[in-house]
Amino acid sequence: EVEKTACPSGKKAREIDESLIFYKKWELEACVDAALLATQMDRVNAIPFTYEQLDVLKHKLDELYPQGYPESVIQHLGYLFLKMSPEDIRKWNVTSLETLKALLEVNKGHEMSPQAPRRPLPQVATLIDRFVKGRGQLDKDTLDTLTAFYPGYLCSLSPEELSSVPPSSIWAVRPQDLDTCDPRQLDVLYPKARLAFQNMNGSEYFVKIQSFLGGAPTEDLKALSQQNVSMDLATFMKLRTDAVLPLTVAEVQKLLGPHVEGLKAEERHRPVRDWILRQRQDDLDTLGLGLQGGIPNGYLVLDLSMQEALS
């Protein structure tokens, strides 16, 4: 808390300008009027106030707007945004995408905090949460903006939150945006992607859908195997185990194309390991890769899950 001291003669700020950079903290507190600051917020970011001076400016705005800042002030916060706590931000009503962009831009790549300069800031998460809740859904423009700043943003959402993503927004998603998504999240995103890209032709469709395939069911993988897609091993390894198990050796061979040779290197890892255990050794031998662990010849395979379904 900065002490209340009288402003020295001749130092009262008539406008927000570069001369204030040389004011000590107590002089900023005493000589800068909060209302002047609020009306000239656009100038604050043009002046390189230090981290400590920003404390004073924030204190003045907090006194002026105890119920939360208006958007006219928020959109010009600039570096001052990084002084805001999640509690401060929860009082805001941010509706403009331009405001969101401006604040995310400020946060991008700046070593702001003495405590944890490289950690993602909690106030950013709160800001995004407030903005998305205000909009009601993650529309394409918002998603475009968020994934541009935070490629991992989508994967930070729960499956429930992802359900509010309209299929049209999926066009904004890049492969790297899904790198950290788990199967539960891909289960939600895959049907949306399938719907979004349904009018594309075979090869173009595969390029777009590829990074979502961790949520694909068996029947879709079977359909892809008929389209000469040549799926790479990295994509195959991310497929749902339960979706891969029912595929035949011939279907996997068609699905992977020339990449089928990569199965040998992955034979001890899921889903390849589990899939091998379900195949006849005879069929595996047709691949000529030396894959071992299939069902020996002459053994009868009972699919108990199918039996249960029938009864």
Partner: antibody, heavy 120, light 107 residues
Amino acid sequence: QVQLQQSGAELVKPGASMKLSCKASGYTFTSYWMHWVRQAPGQGLEWIGAIHPNSDNTIYYQKFKSRVTLTVDKSISTAYMQLSSLTSEDTAVYYCAIIITPVVPKFDYWGQGTTVTVSS
Amino acid sequence: DIQMTQSPSFLSASVGDRVTITCRASHDVGTSLAWYQQKPGQAPKLLIYWASTLQTGVPSRFSGSGSGTEFTLTISSLQPEDFATYYCQQYSSYPLTFGPGTTVDMK
């Protein structure tokens, strides 16, 4: 990578003025404040002032305010520092430097320095 | 203006030594303090900021501590390439000010 290439050494007479240049590359020139710092022989470092290439906003240390002018030419990503009424006390190595985060004014990148000798 | 002082001004040490340099500020600067290394004929190089955060690429034998008015730079095991002059700089308020420097030379 970020590079700040400064102009060559200068020998100037007392009372004259000089204009040093600092050509930036490897980053968006208009994004960051360009600062100037000097170092007299065997002495410490002394901050002079700064300019923001996008807005032309300037801040000057009071000690130099009446004698220094900072400018930029955005078209060639170059910053200039002009210092007038030179005395032998201005003999120093002059550095340009950029600060990535203005609210955390540590000097992230430096030019190689320009040696200025003021002598009759 | 905030005045910065450093001690010692000169320090003779050997490779492998633990070296400690102190920097004092005339006013409280919180943790708004940086350390630089400068070798003859070269520009200063940022080592540490926020008093203790190591700049990317700087060896972990360098460390910083302190807050308020008293700060230290420590080199845990001096290497041949560490013989240089070290400066502290406060960035709590303008004008930005530096300490006078500490020269570390070979014993």
